[in-house]
């Protein structure tokens, strides 16, 4: 029951996390323009992974996508890649985990198969969460670097004078969404991995013991062997116990489905 709850909760947490990673990736507010020391206070600028937007106090918003001719920094491309990899891995993980859920029966799927699928999806969620956290952190580092490097200057450009106004970009809402979402996906993945341990059937290699009916010497056989059917070769009427006798370290183990007298 606890295993099912852990697996189910892990799935739900990861689902919320991946939805958050998708939302963060699509959001425009990765960086917001700090209007301190800016003469155009009626206008607010924010930039995302895909486009830059200008919003006015009147409510008017205009967004423009980034074009390759602008020479986008490699770091931005890296962040895009990390977020997309995170989404893809998370989506595959979700698909795998649906079939791995203990509460869902698909044909005669073995518990061992479900355990493997749970572990696989768990690892995928962990990597997905780490990708998102890494992507958001790289972008945050870019902002911090940009914040301290921004300066005001003046120069003559094509067609006239050009002034650079000191505009600083600060953390946008998408960064916090990304961090939280990545963390949730990571937690969900860990929960799936924990659930996997409970799902996996414990394989026990019992030391079989053969007893003579006459009560003479007991022959201990070090390895497990096939239980006799009671016909054919077992002519001396030996009682065969597959795991009938157990060593001390095996007392805690669960009985095998082959245990019989």
């Amino acid at each position: 029951m606890a295993v099912t709850a852990c697996q189910g909760l892990g799935f739900v947490v990861s689902l919320i996390g991946i939805a958050g990673i998708i939302a963060a990736t699509c959001m425009d507010q990765w960086s917001t323009q700090d209007l301190y020391n800016n003469p155009v206070t009626a206008v607010f600028n924010y930039q995302g992974l895909w486009r830059s937007c200008v919003r006015e106090s009147s409510g008017f918003t205009e967004c423009r996508g980034y074009f390759t001719l602008l020479g986008l920094p490699a770091m931005l491309q890296a962040v895009r890649a990390l977020m997309i990899v995170g989404i893809v891995l998370g989506a595959i993980g979700l698909l795998v985990s649906i079939f791995a859920l203990k509460c869902i029966r698909i044909g005669s799927m073995e518990d061992s198969a479900k355990a493997n699928m749970t572990l696989t999806s768990g690892i995928m969620f962990i990597v997905s969460g780490l990708c998102a956290i890494a992507g958001v952190s790289v972008f945050a580092n870019m902002l911090v670097t940009n914040f301290w490097m921004s300066t005001a200057n003046m120069y003559t450009g094509m067609g006239g004078m050009v002034q650079t106004v000191q505009t600083r970009y600060t953390f946008g809402a998408a960064l916090f969404v990304g961090w939280v979402a990545g963390g949730l996906t990571l937690i969900g993945g860990v929960m799936m991995c924990i659930a996997c341990r409970g799902l996996a059937p414990e394989e026990t290699n019992y030391k079989a013991v053969s007893y003579h009916a006459s009560g003479h010497s007991v022959a201990y056989k070090p390895g497990g062997f096939k239980a006799s059917t009671g016909f054919g070769s077992n002519t001396k009427n030996k009682k065969i116990y597959d795991g009938g006798a157990r060593t001390e370290d095996e007392v805690q183990s669960y009985p095998s489905k082959h245990d019989y007298v």
Epitope: N45, S52, F60, E62, Y66, L70, L72, Q163
Partner: nanobody
């Protein structure tokens, strides 16, 4: 590189009209505001009118009611319709655009080369 190109300047009689236009070309992300400033001989450059992309306009008291600023967002062009011109409107009219050039880049204020407007009495 961003370029501002003005056109429409010239000589006009007092009471006459003139229309200035300014087109922004080049590679940039966003135009924040566009406007017109003027500089009469021996004087400081002063604001005439500005407009945001959303249509919020601002005029100097000396031109209110006579000048009209308008824009074409699709063409990245700003216009200044000047009516009831006076000799004191004689100046070099400069086009201005506040631009965000690229990703995480600082706001840049671009100026045109200027268009001469002369109002004769």
């Amino acid at each position: 590189q961003v370029k501002l190109e003005e056109s429409g300047g010239g000589l006009v009689q007092a009471g006459g009209s003139l229309r200035l236009s300014c087109a922004v070309s080049g590679n940039f992300l966003n135009i924040v505001t566009m406007g017109w400033y003027r500089q009469a001989p021996g004087k400081q450059r002063e604001l005439v009118a500005t407009t945001t992309r959303g249509g919020t306009t601002n005029y100097s008291d000396s031109v209110k009611g006579r000048f009209t600023i308008s824009r074409d967002n699709a063409k990245n062009t700003v216009y200044l319709q000047m009516n009831s011109l006076k000799p004191e409107d004689t100046a070099v009219y400069y086009c201005n655009a506040d631009i965000i050039p690229g990703f995480l880049q600082q706001l840049t204020v671009h100026w045109g080369q200027g268009a001469q407007v002369t109002v004769s009495s």
